[in-house]
């Protein structure tokens, strides 16, 4: 799947032992960019003309509880998840003629998180076992980052995403969202 | 297709607590944010929380914090929501709805279930 | 939290008239801007997403615009069928809001 938003809901990232999460598996809903509508008529679509500059994260917080194998945290932590349409696309046809689908337009804009904060959590763990004192990174705040697809691999990494691609009889589709995209990152940190 | 389908109408004593749930088919269930909103009779709708089904990480409105429990269930798709300390005013028809990835609106909504909350 | 006003709360029309609802929101939500119609007894049903994008299958006379703290949504021609309850909704920030609805009548 091409260009994943950043997801950070897995919010558990260790600074020393934390590893980035993985791409989101595919997502299959794509009528927003390829359906046939307005009875063929050019479709019309929000986010065809704007300046980038109109474009701004989403601020959804979410709370979870921090795991490390058997234990977990006595209190929840809360964090924002980075998302949202961060910049333009323009519109092509579909093979039909009728529907549409989204490409970038040359650069591609990243809601992605900017400032974190550090929190420090008490692990409870079953079997009389000590509590455990770990450090959290959270996310504090999001921003629109402006990419390239040249960008490499390594140059990638914090975005939690691949180089952008569209996936094999796939149409590309910036900006979508996964609820998945960031599991791996608690279950990869010890 | 996508179906999000929910559990039947429920009556409740004052103090009681109810779980209701919503059956997710047709889609990858771990892929979208679920929502709850309800509906109170001849009133508008309300939004309630949100969860990640694949981590399970949640977002309370602060009116029901603390009287709220959303929770998944990965193996049968199927979402949860509990509301507890029930009182009259939560008589309403609560809704699960699936978020669209790309744009940020509700593409999908449960049947609604009505719960009455009467003594 | 974000505060949704939406007005008027509710509006009696012709058919064929052209109906305006507004909504405004408390602080910029960029255009995280969904409009919902609602009938008696049934889920609310996606009209508008994100401000100006008309959903599939929804009738091209309906329309939305607006971007930051002011929007609309326009019925160009209203049909009979065009009857219920709309709600404006952002999806910006948590708490998601909805406005508090404006009622539609056919005159």
């Known amino acids: 799947q091409g260009w994943q938003a950043f997801k950070n809901d897995a919010t558990e990232i260790i600074p020393e032992l934390g590893e980035y999460p993985e791409p989101p598996p595919e997502l299959e809903n794509n009528k927003t960019m390829n359906r046939a509508e307005n009875g063929g008529r050019p479709p019309h679509h929000p986010f065809e003309t704007k300046d980038v500059s109109e474009y701004s994260c989403r601020e959804l917080h979410f709370t979870r509880y921090v795991t490390d194998g058997p234990c977990r945290s006595a209190k929840p932590v809360t964090e924002l998840v980075c998302s949202g349409q961060c910049g333009p696309a323009r519109l092509l046809p579909n093979a039909i003629g009728r529907g549409k689908w989204w490409r970038p337009s040359g650069p591609d804009f990243r809601c992605i998180p900017d400032r974190y904060r550090a929190q420090r959590v008490q692990l409870l763990c079953p079997g009389g076992e000590a509590p455990r004192a770990r450090k959290v990174r959270l996310v504090a705040s999001c921003k629109c980052k402006r990419l390239t697809r040249f960008h490499n691999q390594s140059e990638l990494k914090d975005f939690g995403t691949e180089a952008a691609r569209p996936q094999k009889g796939r149409k590309p589709r910036p900006r979508a969202r996964s609820a998945k995209a960031n599991q791996a990152e608690l279950e990869n940190a010890y | 297709q996508v179906q999000l389908v929910q559990s039947g109408a429920e009556v409740k004593k004052p103090g009681a607590s109810v779980k209701v749930s919503c059956k997710a088919s047709g889609y990858t269930f771990t892929n979208y944010y679920m929502y709850w909103v309800r509906q109170a009779p001849g009133q508008g709708l309300e939004w309630m929380g949100i969860?990640?089904?694949?981590?399970?990480?949640?977002s309370y409105a602060q009116k029901f914090q603390g009287r709220v429990t959303m929770t998944r269930d990965t193996s049968t798709s199927t979402v949860y929501m509990e509301l507890s300390s029930l009182r009259s005013e939560d008589t309403a028809v609560y809704y699960c709805a699936r978020e669209d990835t790309a744009m940020a609106y509700f593409d999908y909504w449960g049947q609604g279930t009505l719960v009455t909350v009467s003594s | 939290d974000i505060q949704m006003t939406q007005s008027p709360s509710s509006l009696s029309a012709s058919v064929g008239d052209r109906v305006t609802i507004t909504c405004r929101a408390s602080q910029t939500i960029s255009n995280y801007l969904n409009w919902y119609q609602q009938k008696p007894g049934k889920a609310p049903n996606l009209l508008i997403y994100?401000?100006?994008g008309l959903q599939s299958g929804v009738p091209s006379r309906f329309s939305g615009s607006g971007s930051g703290t002011d929007f609309t949504l326009t019925i160009s021609s209203l049909q009979p069928e065009d009857f219920g309850t709309y709600y404006c909704q952002q999806s910006f920030s948590t708490p998601i809001t909805f406005g508090q609805g404006t009622r539609l009548e056919i005159k």
């Open positions: 994100a401000a100006s």
């Open positions: 969860i990640n089904p694949s981590g399970g990480s949640t």
